[in-house]
């Protein structure tokens, strides 16, 4: 198995400070998943990223940066329709134990008011492995540009594994994709959050196997209702 590119998979370091809503969910000091800051008290991530307790890294593109904010979180709320069998509705809200301090490096993500169409160029980011199947974890946040793929085209690859709240993205004949450790992280299109990294084939970065994301535009009501309910 050849090395699969040298970033996220086949990406590059993000422009510094360009993803101020990006967070890392840590288990102790170890990367567990990505996520996004929705507001001062809430992080959105994938339901399959659930743990008993989280340490949330915010405010720096570099894991281990002493200037970063690190906030504990012990409450998380999975979407009630999440299935550990089909992985449908793969999203979860994590409530921070204390408020995040907003700054130029810590900002709220913009939730979508509409679903972006196939062909839209988007950016997926994370601190996940840059090689697969052998892992190489970067300390700096990585980015890669991908395009939204229509459900019809994605179903040709994944058949009935694809549910209607799943979103596919990739570049034909390219390795560009997310991988282990990127789960729950953002797919941002035209400045709004359209996807959360959910799953894909393995090893990561197989050409013509798109990444699969939770389609956030289908869940804005649940996100807002859940944050309100658990204020």
């Amino acid at each position: 198995e050849e090395a699969q590119g040298d970033k996220i998979i086949d990406g590059a370091p993000c422009a510094r400070g360009s993803h101020p809503w990006q967070v890392a969910l840590l288990s102790g000091n170890q990367l567990h998943c990505g996520g996004v800051l929705v507001n001062e008290r809430w992080v959105l991530t994938a339901a399959h990223c659930k743990m008993n307790e989280y340490t949330v890294h915010l405010g720096s593109d570099t894991l281990g940066d002493r200037r970063a904010q690190r906030i504990k979180a012990s409450k998380s709320f999975r979407h009630p329709g999440y299935s550990t069998q089909t992985h449908v509705n793969d999203l979860m809200l994590v409530k921070l134990n204390s408020q995040a301090r907003l700054s130029s490096m810590v900002k709220k993500v913009r939730l979508p008011s509409r679903c972006e169409p196939p062909g839209t160029t988007c950016t997926v980011s994370g601190w996940g492995t840059t090689t697969s199947p052998d892992v190489t974890f970067p300390s700096d946040l990585m980015c890669v540009d991908v395009k939204l793929i229509s459900p019809q085209d994605c179903t040709k690859v994944y058949k009935d594994l694809l549910e209607n709240s799943m979103l596919c993205a990739g570049i034909p004949d390219s390795k560009k994709n997310a991988c282990n450790g990127d789960s729950g992280g953002p797919l941002v299109c035209r400045g709004t959050l359209q996807g959360l990294v959910s799953w894909g084939t393995f090893p990561c970065g197989q050409p013509n196997d798109p990444g699969v994301y939770t389609q956030v535009c289908k869940f804005t009501k649940w996100i807002n209702d859940t944050m309100k309910k658990h204020r």
Epitope: S27, Q30, H32, A46, A47, H48, C49, K50, M51, T84, Q85, H87, D90, G128, S132, P133, Y158, K159, L161, A178, C179, N180, G181, D182, S183, V197, S198, W199, G200, T201, F202, C204, V212
Partner: antibody, heavy 122, light 108 residues
Amino acid sequence: QVQLVQSGAEVKKPGASVKVSCKASGYTFTSEGIHWVRQAPGQGLEWMGSISASSGDTNYAQKLQGRVTMTTDTSTSTAYMELRSLRSDDTAVYYCARAAGYGARHWYFDLWGQGTMVTVSS
Amino acid sequence: DIQMTQSPSSLSASVGDRVTITCRASQSISSYLNWYQQKPGKAPKLLIYGASSLQSGVPSRFSGSGSGTDFTLTISSLQPEDFATYYCDQFYSTPPITFGGGTKVEIK
């Protein structure tokens, strides 16, 4: 070294319970799922169920539902499989296996424990 | 549940022979099929994943093909260390993960 090391052989009486352990080393235990597969003497492989090391989510084979419990201890990177109300046809080698994949979905077993022989006999 | 049917259940072959084992799924599993080798008293070992991708460290005489419902494992030139039992499994529609019944490759 990346490996799964299982506990030793067990002999149990019908109606008893057995708990088999599987200790992971050389990789981040919480990033992967652990599955249990058994093999009766001279027979094929039978999937028993799986557990996510981080979330504790479990999926069990229908025929074992109610008799099997899978757990993990992340502080020691150990997975456990307990089987209750043992019968003679539970006599088998029990394997733990790591499923490879990324995100919510996994695709194949890339690492196996050495197996634990469980004999159920009166 | 998806049923996996392997054939033959056993075969006799000589060193240097080309050996073919088939696995049939009861419904389409795309290319999400894997092959494992198991020797007596040992745990299974992954040979092929995703129907045709060779696992790292596995000799190139092993190859896999197929998609949908019909899959094949081929050993191009059987070596003494290849005498073992071979299993397929599917990770497409899970749970449960289902295995084929196994094919025992014996010395002629």
